[in-house]
Interface confidence: low
């Protein structure tokens, strides 16, 4: 059943004398493996013998033996799928039909393949896209219906006989569907490639020429133009004439329209290849070109820069930046339309020429107030000198200058006065808008720049003011020199360093913290009595009678100040001791008698001792000695001794007389 045999291979294979042919082939014999294979050249079926006649190029038998003459032809297949063949070398007379006679156990099949062998290598075929436009990338394809593993070839691209720089991609196909070698070249043609010859050359492995194909490039492009100008440098003066000519060097397809452009804008009523400009003005300066169009699009010539020369126009000044801050830098720029560019500039400040300034720019690195004013300039080129324009105003801003604090009062100022100060300055830009004062107090500012200090303090030493615009400038502080009475007057003991004892040498000092004016007088007083007029009050030998309340006074031309009262305390041993008796120095026996030890002491007596007429100390230590009941034997002379921290003192003798009572006398 022949329908069981399925073959796949190229229908026709192409080669040339001496090359080789590789025949990719697959088959399927469904009833079993291949048992016999014969390759015929131009086979013909013999009805008589029921067999095929023809040249046997290859034969395989059940025992697998292959005759030696069959080495040129190789069956590279197998018993069930592959039927690939190779003929190497292939000859011209191999052209025709190849017959593959296949036999399995039960089935037979004859498969026919066409072989076309030429005498010489046949040329490849160049394929071009339908239209080629300049600068648009295209792919050129060179196709050769040949490929064989045993015969390597190469395809090379040439432009006007010279190998092309662009890298080509070569691919081969040896499949059951197709056998070919292909080279693809990506290429961006320029207008200059129009009409040029492109060749695809077939070469063997050694680069030897075998065959080729050529095509002529038809590159569509916009018109290519050349512009010519008289005069050739395109530099003229106002009133001269200029001629420009446009020449088309190439156009594909042919051009259709012509126009002229200035600075990118079309010139009306200029549609010929010549542009005539008569009596040119400076406004006609600019970039000129011609534009010619075809179906691809417009083509433009290179630009011609027409320069119409003229003397400088009236100049203007640009200031970077105004207003300027004193100390900053400022740049002035002289702007004047002129062709050629000005070569020299003259600068003016407030109408007066600025010496040594001949450049387009004037740079002042450190602006000062006197730089303010109007700046103007004049530009000059080879055709003449321009006019001075209106100029520009430079405003120089600076902090207030020469700020001073001025005291408006008559001098001297006394503590408690009302003081008025004003803040003055020499100049300021912008104007002064506010003032500041140091130190900061709860003071009155009756008007701008005036400070009123009510009841000025003795310690208001200096005042400084600042005049402020955008900045504050401080004046040097001014001394108020407030005059006041002596302050903080007090009595200070200089000696002795410890407590004062009777008989000590004592010095008291009258101190004060400050006085303005400095010239002062001193006064000492005790209990309203004037004691001295020196700063010190001295006692050579102090006595208890000197104790008391002392004050000192210090006065200057403004006033006088008293110290607080200072108490002088003198310490002394007990003195002026005496014994007093109560109810008297004569007492009846049985009654009560009280003896008191009276004394004068500082500090007071802390300890008393009593003595009798025999100078015997009595066991009593208080100020009072109480005898109750008093006896006649108590009669006699008594004295006492007082002791304090300073020393001791004793009293003279005092006699107590105790007489008998009437009862005692009656008993006797």
């Amino acid at each position: 059943d022949s329908s069981k045999w399925v073959f796949e291979h190229p229908e026709t294979l192409y080669a040339w004398e001496g090359a080789c042919v590789w025949i990719p082939c697959t088959y399927r014999a469904l009833d079993g493996d291949l048992e016999s294979f014969i390759l015929f050249h131009n086979p013909e079926y013999n009805k008589n013998t029921s067999k095929f006649d023809g040249t046997r190029l290859y034969e395989s038998t059940k025992d697998g033996k292959v005759p030696s003459e069959q080495k040129r032809v190789q069956f590279l297949g197998d018993k069930n799928k592959n039927c690939t063949l190779s003929i190497h070398p292939v000859h011209l007379n191999d052209s025709g039909q190849l017959g593959l006679r296949m036999e399995s156990k039960t089935e037979k099949w004859m498969e026919r393949i066409h072989l076309n062998v030429s005498e010489r290598p046949f040329p490849p075929h160049i394929q071009l896209p339908p239209e080629i436009q300049e600068s648009q990338e295209v792919t050129l394809t060179c196709l050769l219906n040949f490929s064989c593993y045993g015969y390597p070839i190469q395809l090379q691209w040439l432009l006007e006989g010279v190998p092309m720089r662009q890298a080509a991609v070569t691919s081969t196909s040896l499949t059951i569907k197709s056998v070919f070698t292909r080279s693809e070249l990506k290429f961006s043609p320029q207008w200059s490639h129009h009409g040029k010859i492109v060749t695809c050359q077939l070469q063997d492995a050694d680069g030897k020429f075998l065959s080729n194909d050529t095509v002529q490039l038809n590159v569509k492009h916009t018109p290519k133009l050349e512009i010519k100008v008289t005069p050739s440098d395109a530099i003229v003066r106002e009133g001269d004439s200029v001629t420009m000519t446009c020449e088309v060097s190439s156009s594909n397809p042919e051009y259709t329209t012509v126009s002229w452009l200035k600075d990118g804008t079309s010139l009306k009523k200029q549609n010929t290849f010549t542009l005539n400009l008569r009596e040119v003005t400076k406004d006609q300066s600019g970039k000129y070109c011609c534009q010619v169009s075809n179906d691809v699009g417009p083509g433009r010539s290179e630009e011609v820069f027409l320069q119409v020369q003229y003397a400088p126009e009236p100049s203007t000044v640009q200031i970077l930046h105004s207003p300027a801050v004193e100390g900053s830098q400022v740049e002035f720029l002289c702007m004047s339309l002129a062709n050629p560019l000005p070569t020299n500039y003259t600068w003016y400040h407030n109408g007066k020429e600025m010496q040594g300034r001949t450049e387009e720019k004037v740079h002042i690195p450190k602006i000062l107030p006197w730089h303010a004013g109007t700046y103007s300039c004049v530009a000059e080129n080879i055709l003449g000198t321009g006019q001075r324009g209106p100029g520009a105003e430079l405003d120089v801003q600076y902090p207030p200058k020469k700020v001073t604090t001025v005291i408006q009062n008559p001098m001297p100022i006394r503590e408690g006065d009302t003081v008025t100060l004003s803040c003055n300055y020499n100049s300021s830009n912008p104007s002064v808008t506010r003032y500041e004062w140091k130190p900061h107090g709860a003071w009155e500012e009756p008007s701008l720049g005036v400070l009123k200090i009510q009841n000025v303090g003795w310690d208001n030493t200096t005042i400084a003011c600042a005049a402020c615009n955008s900045w504050c400038s401080w004046a040097s502080p001014v001394a108020l020199n407030v005059q006041y009475a002596p302050r903080d007057v007090r009595v200070r003991k200089i000696k002795p360093l410890s407590e004062i004892h009777s008989g000590n040498s004592v010095s008291l000092q009258c101190d004060f913290s400050s006085s303005h004016p400095k010239e002062v007088q001193f006064f000492w007083e005790k209990n309203g009595r004037l004691l001295g007029k020196e700063s010190q009050l001295n006692f050579d030998s102090i006595s208890p009678e000197d104790a008391g309340s002392y004050s000192c006074w210090v006065n200057n031309s403004i006033g006088q100040t008293a110290s607080k009262a200072w108490t002088l305390e003198v310490l002394y041993a007990p003195r002026r001791l005496r014994v007093s008796m109560s109810p008297g120095d004569q007492v009846m026996e049985g009654k009560s008698a009280t003896l008191t030890c009276e004394s004068d002491a500082n500090p007071p007596v802390s300890h008393y001792t009593w003595f009798d007429w025999n100078n015997q100390s009595l066991p009593y230590h208080s100020q009072k000695l109480r005898l109750e009941p008093v006896k006649v034997q108590h009669s006699g002379a008594y004295w006492c001794q007082g002791t304090n921290s300073v020393g001791k003192g004793r009293s003279p003798l005092s006699t107590l007389t105790v007489y008998y009572s009437p009862e005692t006398i009656g008993r006797r």
């Epitope: 902090p399 500041e436 140091k438 130190p439 900061h440 400084a464 600042a466 402020c468 955008s470 900045w471 504050c472 400038s473 401080w474």
Partner: nanobody, 125 residues
Framework: EVQLVESGGGLVQGGGSLRVSCVAS????????MGWFRQAPGKEREFVAA????????SYADSVKGRFTISRENAKNTAYLQMNSLKPEDTAVYYC??????????????????WGQGTQVTVSS
């Protein structure tokens, strides 16, 4: 001779605090406005904070507002910069500067008359 001496810089962790001081000598401190500037490696000197001579008016850069506080003690001739919630981007050399005009251009380094040598503040992450 006028001298501004900064101190108190050092290494601190992110989120930490630092107080830098600037002691002035050779000038009437109470007449001068004070400013703090900083400069990180490869960057321009930038304004941080300023205070007027009285101590009742202050200005701050947006990047430090709410975190830094400038103050002064005229009796001690000293200006302070208290830096809280420090960030690694606060790392720089901190300079104090004194200016004569108390009311203008507190942000511009060129308007300051005297400068200190700087103190390094490094904030680690």
């Amino acid at each position: 001779e006028v001298q501004l001496v900064e101190s108190g810089g050092g290494l601190v962790q992110g989120g930490g605090s630092l107080r830098v001081s600037c002691v002035a000598s050779g000038l009437s401190f109470s007449l001068y406005g004070m400013g703090w500037f900083r400069q990180a490696p490869g960057k321009e000197r930038e304004f941080v904070a300023a205070i007027n001579w009285r101590g009742d008016s202050t200005s701050y850069a947006d990047s430090v507002k709410g975190r830094f506080t400038i103050s002064r003690e005229n009796a001690k001739n000293t200006a302070y910069l208290q830096m809280n919630s420090l960030k690694p981007e606060d790392t720089a050399v901190y300079y104090c500067a004194a200016r004569k005009y108390s009311a203008a251009n507190v942000f511009k380094p060129n308007d300051y008359d005297y400068w200190g040598q700087g103190t390094q503040v490094t904030v680690s992450s």
